[in-house]
């Protein structure tokens, strides 16, 4: 894979629901979570934990007590909650169709090629990391092609897949400007956000980057991006696509 | 948010409270003017549907979340992989109407990014307007708690979630007991400081009651899903 | 230093409209909600409404739903309350106060000077 | 809507001693271990000034003598000792939920 990634009104009666408490122990289904590993199924255990109190709190103006986890029509509980209060709600028309359909059939990257191979969000399909950003599209979403770029560790630096290397680097600060900060935030996701672009010395020992070949043209910042082995500024991109995680002094929190 | 104490203004800026039926249900963070990291327990069908929803950032108190005050979502997408039985992968996005504005109050949490390193017992954070002891009601102010990282492989032992924990969850809390988030918190952020920036290190999820000893707090490790989250970004875009 | 800046006088005549305007500095003006207050000649404080400048969306007393109208300008840093269909009851100081709603308490730290409307004919 | 009842509506306090001004809710004011209760004093041709926040709290650049005490339904103000500048009229405010309301005023005057 590549990227690693108005007033509250009193509360209600409520029932008591632990939640899924198997009666036998056994396998649950093999369940796939993102990134690089593969997850084994858990194991459950006739345990003493209540399993599962999701910590959600639902409740209604007029709440009504469900004793079963769907209810009849129109009113529908959490159930697997510790408070399990239900919201009465119309459903007829929250019919969500082919949208919820294509959003259920996505599969989630790495979910069924091997580790080396990164899946096709919009098909499925498995394409071998060598023609990941590669310039060339190989995804019917073309999606292997606008998820080269991420922010690596708590400095937030640039890095660039290389697709003959198969491996992410850091980006020079040779020659680089904000108008490409403002390109990589935006293939990231950050659609109207950027917030800073700056050289910091690269700590990370790396002896591989990615550098901009000025005299590219008005191409795409990728193709503009070449391997190289030296970074003469001694320094790499340092990326904020927003301006995120500040707080006013939480060191106030004590009162 | 049991054994916490009430928040100042701007402390947890990224803190936001979504409303069903002018009902707080879930706590969220801001991860954009324009998105919103809560839970995917907290969007379960008929709750996918954004109508439902508005959000309330930069308001501390329960009381003053009228329904001008709030952000309509005009989007729920809720983990692909999500498992309601197991709450495994159990995050959601909202996309708000209107883009929120950022002011002292209102910021949005840094997303973690890979290479990030936590050590075991990392101090982090957690907020939210959640009962303040199990089974209890509500909260009418913010409250946050300092609680501690555990070690999945110990969370994982036998006394604490048997083998429960998935690498998609991250245990937070205190083996003693007396600190934990709580129902009503659902959603709501686990965040730690590095570098002197904050970080969206999980998403409240699960617990077995609440500050019970040997049952820490459940949440979401926020760093397996940030490509996830950037995708759907992308996707919208 | 933090202001609220009103004018001082407003003469209108009965059934006609006003507009007060309210001029904020000092502050982040989207961080606070701004309250609009009534005060009758030798009388109390009545609570008109607030508008949160951030989404512009407004909560009024009952009492004053069909009479007022809050509006913000956020390049400006005003805030304006519109009275409409004026009559001699409207005849009051009308202060505009600021209210830090990203805090628990929910207090009116700073006033500003406040308008006098006089509705004569 | 909470109503907030002041009394008395008026008092006449000689220089020096203890004013007593009370407020009384329809409704509890307090929760989530808060007293939104607040005070304010109001002089002739002036806006209101905020004197004390949730209930016991001095606003910055208060003097000390003002003081506030009370919870859930029933609050008090305290001037004490009451200076020739403490003639005004005083307000009390509650914020437990919107709308936010006054009670009547209380008009201290001096003796």
């Known amino acids: 894979m590549a990227l690693n990634s108005g007033s509250p009104p009193a509360i209600g009666p409520y029932y008591e629901n632990h939640g899924y408490q198997p009666e036998n122990p056994y396998p649950a289904q093999p369940t796939v979570v993102p990134t690089v590993y593969e997850v084994h199924p858990a194991q459950y255990y006739p345990s003493p934990v209540p399993q599962y109190a999701p910590r959600v709190l639902t409740q209604a103006s007029n709440p009504v007590v469900c004793t079963q986890p769907k209810s009849p029509s129109g009113t529908v509980c959490t159930s697997k909650t510790k408070k399990a209060l239900c919201i009465t709600l119309t459903l007829g028309t929250f019919l969500v169709g082919a949208a919820l359909a294509a959003g259920l059939l996505w599969k989630f990257m790495g979910s069924k090629c091997s580790n080396s191979g990164i899946e096709c969000d919009s098909s499925g399909t498995c394409i071998n990391p060598s023609n990941w950003c590669d310039g060339v599209s190989h995804c019917p979403g073309g999606e292997d092609e606008n998820r080269c770029v991420r922010l690596y560790g708590p400095n937030f630096i640039l890095q660039v897949y290389s697709s003959q290397r198969k491996s992410w680097h850091p980006v020079c600060q040779d020659d680089w400007n904000e108008n490409y900060g403002r390109a990589a935030c935006r293939d990231m996701g950050y659609k109207n956000n950027f917030y800073s672009s700056q050289g910091i010395v690269d700590d990370s020992g790396s002896t591989s980057f990615m550098k901009l070949n000025t005299s590219a043209g008005n191409v795409d910042i990728y193709k503009k991006l070449y391997h190289s082995d030296a970074c003469s500024s001694k320094a790499v991109v340092s990326l904020r696509c927003i301006a995120c995680g500040v707080n006013l002094n939480s060191s106030r929190q004590s009162r | 948010i049991v054994g916490g104490e009430s928040a100042l203004p701007g402390a947890w800026p990224w803190q936001v409270s979504l409303h069903v039926q002018n009902v707080h249900v879930c706590g969220g963070s801001i991860i954009t003017p324009e998105w919103i990291v809560t839970a995917a327990h907290c969007v379960e069908k008929p709750l996918n549907n954004p109508a439902h929803w508005t959000a309330f950032a930069g308001i501390l108190r329960q009381s003053f979340m009228f329904y001008g005050a709030g952000y309509q979502v005009e989007k729920v997408i809720s983990h692909p992989n999500y498992d309601s039985k197991t709450k495994n992968n159990d995050i959601a996005l909202m996309k708000l109407q209107k883009p929120l504005t950022f002011n002292d109050l209102v910021k949005p949490v840094c997303l973690p990014n890979p290479g990030m390193m936590l050590q075991p017992e990392q101090l982090c954070w957690i907020s939210g307007w959640g009962a303040t002891e199990e089974k209890g009601k509500t909260s009418e102010v913010l409250n946050a708690a300092k609680v501690l990282l555990i070690e999945t492989q110990r969370c994982n032992s036998r006394y604490v979630y048997d083998n429960l924990i998935t690498p998609a969850m991250i245990c937070a809390g205190f083996l003693q007991g007396n600190v934990d988030s709580c129902q009503g918190d659902s959603g709501g952020p686990l965040v730690t400081s590095k570098n002197n920036i904050w970080w969206l290190i999980g998403d409240t999820s699960w617990g077995s009651g609440c500050a019970k000893a040997y049952r820490p707090g459940v949440y979401g490790n926020v760093m397996v899903f940030t490509d996830w989250i950037y995708r759907q970004m992308r996707a919208d875009g | 230093q933090v202001q609220l800046q009103q004018p001082g006088a407003e003469l209108a005549k009965p059934g006609a409209s006003v507009k007060l305007s309210c001029k904020a500095s000092g502050y982040t003006f989207t961080s606070y909600w701004m309250h609009w207050v009534k005060q009758r000649p030798g009388q109390g404080l009545e609570w008109i409404g607030l508008?949160?400048?951030?989404?512009?969306?407004?909560n009024y007393n009952e009492k004053f739903k069909s009479k007022a109208t809050l509006t913000v300008d956020k390049s400006s840093r005003t805030a304006y309350m519109q009275l409409s269909s004026l009559t001699s009851e409207d005849s009051a100081v009308y202060y505009c106060a600021r209210w830090d709603y990203g805090s628990s308490y929910g207090y009116f730290d700073v006033w500003g000077t406040g308008t006098t409307v006089t509705v004569s004919s | 809507d909470i109503v907030l009842t002041q009394s008395p509506a008026s008092l006449a306090v000689s220089l020096g001693q203890r004013a007593t001004i009370s407020c009384r809710a329809s409704e509890s004011v307090s929760t989530s271990g808060y007293s939104y209760m607040h005070w304010y004093q109001q002089k002739p041709g002036q806006p209101p000034k905020l004197l004390i926040y949730?209930?016991?709290n001095l606003e910055s650049g208060v003097p000390v003598r003002f003081s506030g005490s009370g919870s859930g339904t029933d609050f008090t103000l305290n001037i004490h000792p009451v200076e020739e500048e403490d003639a005004a009229t005083y307000y009390c405010?509650?914020?437990?939920?919107?709308?936010?309301?006054f009670g009547a005023g209380t008009k201290l005057e001096l003796k």
């Open positions: 949730l209930a016991s």
């Open positions: 405010q509650h914020s437990r939920e919107l709308p936010p309301t």
């Open positions: 508008i949160p400048p951030n989404s512009g969306s407004s």
